[in-house]
């Protein structure tokens, strides 16, 4: 007996071939011997089966001795043994229809779990193997669970259902709702304008929700809400903003915030949260601001940074075109009685300059 696997909602062709390449009498029945379709003259006739309105046959192939039955919009309960009677012989085809669906919405927040459930006909014992867009393989039986979704799980999941050495493939599109980056750091000289951007890692037709940026300044004892906003159909509107600093926010996506001036008192870490309508939980992105200041006071040239810096970062003071350099893995460096000339303050990570500030030291007479 031939076994054919089908997908719920799909269309399947059950083949039946005759040796003579001409129109001949044929009909298809189910396991209860109820006629589904057949031929009368040149006409296709339908029987009393519940399948009849979804069953068809390809007339132009009859001349080739091919008397296939096509079943549209497959249902799990269409799983059965079908009998094709042609040229005084019977061909049996066992059809097994499977369905694979996500238990919840396929738009899930990062960190949430995904469960895929297999619908299968009674008596079948299928196995399921799913591959994520990132190449992660997960195996299971009736259910497949992914406990904590990551950004890279967004995309088309390909799941293969196997039964009786036959396979059928399902494709399920999963959208992980997250920001493109978990964390980002902006490095600025004191006084410069600061741009924070929070691009999303997904697109939705309608995007509605609300968000807030909480800020923990390095110098402050507690965090403070800098701005709250609403998102309606991808349009951003500010609800409330602090007076100091007076942030500005772009009206369109991606979410974009502007701090007019980078000042040491603003250096620190922020957490932007976005709650989407009809979704439980929030999207998060951490943002850090590092501010540099180079000053000369009397005989002391100082370079300082504020904000979250890694201990492996190097802060240096260097006289342009000269060898004179002072470097430290610290948040401040200084030179006493500096030589006249253009000094550079550099914040670097393994030789890569993250931030640079120049200060001119004039000769003292």
């Amino acid at each position: 007996k031939k076994v054919v696997l089908g997908k719920k909602g799909d269309t399947v062709e059950l083949t039946c071939n005759a040796s003579q390449k001409k129109n001949t009498q044929f009909h298809w029945k189910n396991s209860n011997q109820i006629k589904i379709l057949g031929i009368q003259g040149l006409f296709l006739t339908k029987g009393p089966s519940k399948l009849s309105d979804r069953a068809d046959s390809r007339k132009s192939l009859w001349d080739q001795g091919c008397f296939s039955m096509i079943i549209k919009n497959l249902k799990i309960e269409d799983s059965d043994t079908y009998i094709c009677e042609v040229e005084n012989k019977k061909e049996e085809v066992e059809l097994l229809v499977f369905g694979l669906t996500a238990n919840s919405d396929t738009h899930l927040l990062e960190g949430q779990s995904l469960t895929l459930t297999l619908e299968s006909p009674p008596g079948s014992s299928p196995s399921v193997k799913c591959r994520s867009p990132g190449g992660k393989n997960i195996q299971g039986g009736r259910t497949i669970s992914v406990p904590q979704l990551e950004r890279q799980d967004s995309g088309t999941w390909t799941c293969t259902v196997s039964q009786d050495q036959k396979t059928v493939e399902f494709k399920i599109d999963i959208v992980v709702l997250a920001f493109q980056k978990a964390s980002s750091t902006v490095y600025k000289k004191e006084g410069e304008q600061v741009e924070f951007s929070f691009p999303l890692a997904f697109t939705l037709e309608k995007l509605t929700g609300s968000g807030e940026l909480w800020w923990q300044a390095e110098r402050a004892s507690s965090s403070k809400s800098w701005i709250t906003f609403d998102l309606k159909n991808k349009e951003v509107s500010v609800k409330r903003v602090t007076q100091d600093p007076k942030l500005q926010m772009g009206k369109k996506l991606p979410l974009h915030l502007t701090l007019p001036q980078a000042l040491p008192q603003y250096a620190g870490s922020g957490n932007l949260t976005l709650a989407l309508e009809a979704k439980t939980g929030k999207l998060h992105q951490e943002v850090n601001l590092v501010v540099m200041r180079a000053t000369q006071f009397q005989e002391n040239l100082t370079c300082e940074v504020w904000g979250p810096t890694s201990p492996k970062l190097t802060l240096s003071l260097k006289l342009e075109n000269k060898g004179a350099t002072v470097s430290k893995q610290a948040k401040a460096v200084w030179v006493l009685n500096p030589e006249a000339g253009m000094w550079q303050c550099l914040l670097s990570d393994s030789g890569q300059v993250l931030l640079e500030s120049n200060i001119k030291v004039v000769p003292t007479w």
Partner: antibody
Framework: QVQLQQWGAGLLKPSETLSLTCAVS????????WSWIRQPPGKGLEWIGE???????NCNPSLKSRVTISVDTSNNQFSLKLSSVTAADTAVYYC?????????WGQGTLVTVSS | DIQMTQSPSSVSASVGDRVTITCRAS??????LAWYQQKPGKAPELLIY???SLQSGVPSRFSGSGSGTDFTLTISSLQPEDFATYFC?????????FGGGTKVESK
Amino acid sequence: QVQLQQWGAGLLKPSETLSLTCAVSGGSFSGYYWSWIRQPPGKGLEWIGEINHSGSTNCNPSLKSRVTISVDTSNNQFSLKLSSVTAADTAVYYCARVLNYFDYWGQGTLVTVSS
Amino acid sequence: DIQMTQSPSSVSASVGDRVTITCRASPDIANWLAWYQQKPGKAPELLIYAASSLQSGVPSRFSGSGSGTDFTLTISSLQPEDFATYFCQQANSFPLTFGGGTKVESK
């Protein structure tokens, strides 16, 4: 909703090979046949040929020697190649889904053969 | 090959008119016939299949009849959006063939 999106070169020189691809989305790919039909400017429709998901083809005998139809089931796509084109092959080429009748069509691609 | 002959090749009509187009098959094709509507610059659209079954979403003013060799497409009350070219197609045997088309234009 089933959609067929087709693409390919629109301007060819005589003796070149016409090449078109059609991508199917939003519906079943197996169980149906996938056809190519053409329509010369201001004229009627001519069936070129068809293929199913397992690669079984049927072609119009008038074009069979020049036609190659192939299928890429992993991407739900099928393609047409028509070799040694002449000005008589200038037409709008359509891809379509067929069981007995053509119920979904691509947008059409005008292919002009000119020296 | 099965020959499909459509008549007339064009018909002039007014909104509200009853329009009839015929298609003759040679040889007999039972009820393996479809009707399509095509507007300029667009792909054809299936109206009627199996000679008399109305395709989902098609207005009920369109109807099909006939069997064997002679078939008819009727538009009971012509609407402004019905001015187009109509084709018949046989699905009885390969090669699948179409009629030459009937253009319904405004009187």
